[in-house]
């Protein structure tokens, strides 16, 4: 249904409210150095515009195109060239260029500083002085250090930022109350930035059939009991949500987002068992909730996956018919029954099945060619299962630091150009997969571990794209997008590798140290592991260990010591040379 | 390679019941879809019925609906197939077959028993 003003039609279909935040990230994620009074006035400027279309939707300019209204506000920007170097050349293109080309400079990892949290009483303050200025500058960090971010999530996260500080700042111990929830939103926002960076790097790097497949396999789990074509139905609209919301049109995204879970409420009858209490919700916690739905159960009487895709004569004849809508069906059915696999593994088998298919259909004996094709499945199901069996045995005996210690030093070697502030994030989110994972039940632990090392691998292949350092990282990132896992863990030592040359300042500390929390101290350490392994690859774990034990030892004893600055010059030269003879440096 | 072992078959009246069990060895079942099939007399091998890997779905041949229950327990590596309501016409060999992370199927399965005599009089 064409609109005389699209602008017109998503102001009133989103409200105000929303519209201005929606807005205000969309703005943030593009242009990402911008001070916030900037983009306050950008935003304010379009809310009046379009409430002059609301009016009139024939007046003038309001039959423009979102991306035409948002880049010539964007290109207005007196300091564009200055801040943003080449991407002002954006603005002497067209749309849809000139959208695009702004989408290329999005930076995953942008030279912003780090958000420090002001004291408590401050935030307080600040809260009950302006309330609406603090949310929305709560939008604006969030959205330019994080420019892929769901944006109609982003929404449901601000509003409960905003309802802490509503509870909390009337507590009778206010930090009690509201720091452990400002880390919980800090902790699932970051979760929820990587998943949904994911999301649009799958639908960028290897586009729309990757995303379907990806989102067949994961609603089919979660709703096993819907019939193929509800399923489809729900994937079409969900790949046209986050399209949208990839490619910068929020408003869009975030309308077509309500649209998608009042239709699934509709329906939850002939989708799951599992919606009635995320559908009695208000939108944006409706939308969360229907997102992080638990799998319903699976039917009953499910009949074997074999008389359709393998003993069919028909297999050949219903492939060439449709192949897409075939192999669909074929990971519908797989994964309705499958809540146990991985979507990567689901998809590496449908994979393996359009492959038979292919091979076969054009042989003399098509059915003797593929009747044995689910014997090829053996090997790729217990490829994951005793890997995650194995690191959960690990984790279980190491705990989560020095698990990811052991992890640094093995995707270090494995990667050793890669930077190592990258290498510290990358492993430290790898690690966390066991405290995620391991606690599960075997029948959980498969699709938790997996899935969570699909969205930690593709922080690495984005912070990588950015400035490619290593031939192993770049084809293991662009050769297949459900194979990324295992390419990575396939990796053995990089024996072209040129060891670093020693550099006694990295391994010089100061007093600072002790003052650090305990997860900025860790950092730290790993930071030094990291750089121990790039001087000394072929280093043994035991020779590591050592070291790091000596490390840990000598910031506890220097920490105590009455005059720390001098015990960490004279003891820390002590360290470094006899780490340099542990390592044979 | 995984082995199975029926047991607990025999000779039962007509209306009677009988429980049979096929134990697994040789690997854990709960990558498996479990079955059972069965050959009467001079007749062909038949397809009775099949069990998904964690027991949530169940699929029978329409001769046994109602009639016959399978469960598994994973935990001891085995499967079971609950026989009531006997007719004379269920008599005959019943094999335990497993199949690699489906159900499996008359012709469709990766291992099977050397199977249990059943006999309805």
């Known amino acids: 249904d064409a609109h005389k003003s699209e602008v017109a039609h998503r102001f009133k279909d989103l409200g105000e409210e929303n519209f201005k935040a929606l807005v205000l990230i969309a703005f943030a994620q593009y242009l990402q150095q911008c001070p916030f009074e900037d983009h306050v006035k950008l935003v304010n400027e379009v809310t009046e515009f379009a409430k002059t279309c609301v009016a009139d939707e024939s007046a003038e300019n309001c039959d423009k195109s979102l991306h035409t209204l948002f880049g010539d506000k964007l290109c207005t920007v007196a300091t564009l060239r200055e801040t943003y170097g080449e991407m002002a050349d954006c603005c002497a293109k067209q749309e849809p260029e000139r959208n695009e080309c702004f989408l290329q400079h999005k930076d995953d990892n942008p030279n912003l500083p780090r958000l420090v949290r002001p004291e408590v009483d401050v935030m307080c303050t600040a809260f009950h002085d302006n309330e609406e200025t603090f949310l929305k500058k709560y939008l604006y960090e969030i959205a330019r250090r994080h420019p892929y971010f769901y944006a109609p999530e982003l929404l449901f996260f601000a509003k409960r930022y905003k309802a802490a500080f509503t509870e909390c700042c009337q507590a009778a111990d206010k930090a009690a109350c509201l720091l452990p929830k400002l880390d919980e939103l800090r902790d699932e926002g970051k979760a929820s930035s990587a998943k949904q960076r994911l999301k649009c790097a799958s639908l960028q790097k290897f586009g729309e059939r990757a995303f379907k497949a990806w989102a067949v396999a994961r609603l089919s789990q979660r709703f096993p009991k819907a019939e193929f074509a509800e399923v489809s139905k729900l994937v079409t609209d969900l790949t046209k949500v986050h399209t949208e919301c990839c490619h910068g049109d929020l408003l869009e995204c975030a309308d077509d987002r309500a649209d998608l879970a009042k239709y699934i409420c509709e329906n939850q009858d002939s989708i799951s068992s599992k919606l009635k209490e995320c559908c009695e919700k208000p939108l944006l916690e409706k939308s969360h909730c229907i997102a992080e739905v638990e799998n319903d159960e699976m039917p009953a009487d499910l009949p074997s996956l074999a008389a359709d895709f393998v003993e069919s004569k028909d297999v050949c004849k219903n492939y060439a018919e449709a192949k897409d809508v075939f192999l669909g069906m074929f990971l519908y059915e797989y994964a309705r029954r499958h809540p146990d696999y991985s979507v990567v593994l689901l998809l590496r088998l449908a994979k393996t099945y359009e492959t038979t298919l292919e091979k076969c259909c054009a042989a003399a004996d098509p059915h003797e060619c593929y009747a044995k094709v689910f014997d090829e499945f053996k090997p790729l199901v217990e490829e994951p299962q005793n890997l995650i069996k194995q690191n959960c045995e690990l984790f279980e005996q190491l705990g989560e630091y020095k698990f990811q210690n052991a992890l640094l030093v093995r995707y270090t070697k494995k990667v050793p150009q890669v930077s190592t502030p990258t290498l510290v994030e990358v492993s430290r989110n790898l690690g966390k997969v066991g405290s995620k994972c391991c606690k599960h039940p075997e029948a959980k632990r498969m699709p938790c571990a997996e899935d969570y090392l699909s969205v930690v691998l593709n922080q690495l292949c984005v912070l990588h794209e950015k400035t490619p350092v290593s031939d192993r990282v770049t084809k293991c990132c662009t050769e297949s997008l459900v194979n990324r896992r295992p390419c990575f863990s396939a990796l053995e030592v990089d024996e072209t590798y040129v060891p670093k040359e020693f550099n006694a300042e990295t391994f010089t500390f100061h007093a600072d140290i002790c003052t650090l929390s305990e997860k900025e101290r860790q950092i730290k350490k790993q930071t030094a592991l990291v750089e121990l392994v790039k001087h000394k690859p072929k280093a043994t774990k035991e020779q590591l260990k050592a070291v790091m034990d000596d490390f840990a030892a000598f910031v506890e004893k220097c920490c105590k010591a009455d005059d720390k600055e001098t015990c960490f010059a004279e003891e820390g030269k002590k360290l470094v040379a006899a780490s340099q003879a542990a390592l044979g440096l | 390679d995984v082995q199975l072992v029926e047991s607990g078959g025999g000779l039962v009246q007509a209306g009677g019941s009988l429980r049979l069990s096929c134990a697994a060895s040789?690997?854990?079942?709960?990558?498996?879809?479990m079955g059972w099939l069965r050959q009467g007399p001079g007749k062909e091998r038949e397809f009775v019925g099949s069990?998904?890997?964690?027991?949530?779905?169940?699929h029978y041949a329409d001769s046994v609906k109602g009639r016959f229950i399978i469960s598994r327990d994973n935990a001891k590596n085995t499967v079971y197939l609950q026989m009531n309501s006997l007719k004379p016409e269920d008599t005959g060999v019943y094999y335990c077959?497993?199949?690699?992370?489906?159900?499996?199927?008359?012709?469709?399965?990766?291992?099977r028993g050397q199977g249990t005599q059943v006999t309805v009089s």
């Open positions: 069990i998904n890997w964690n027991g949530a779905t169940t």
């Open positions: 077959v497993a199949q690699f992370s489906v159900q499996p199927t008359l012709q469709t399965y990766d291992y």
């Open positions: 040789g690997g854990t079942i709960s990558n498996y879809g």
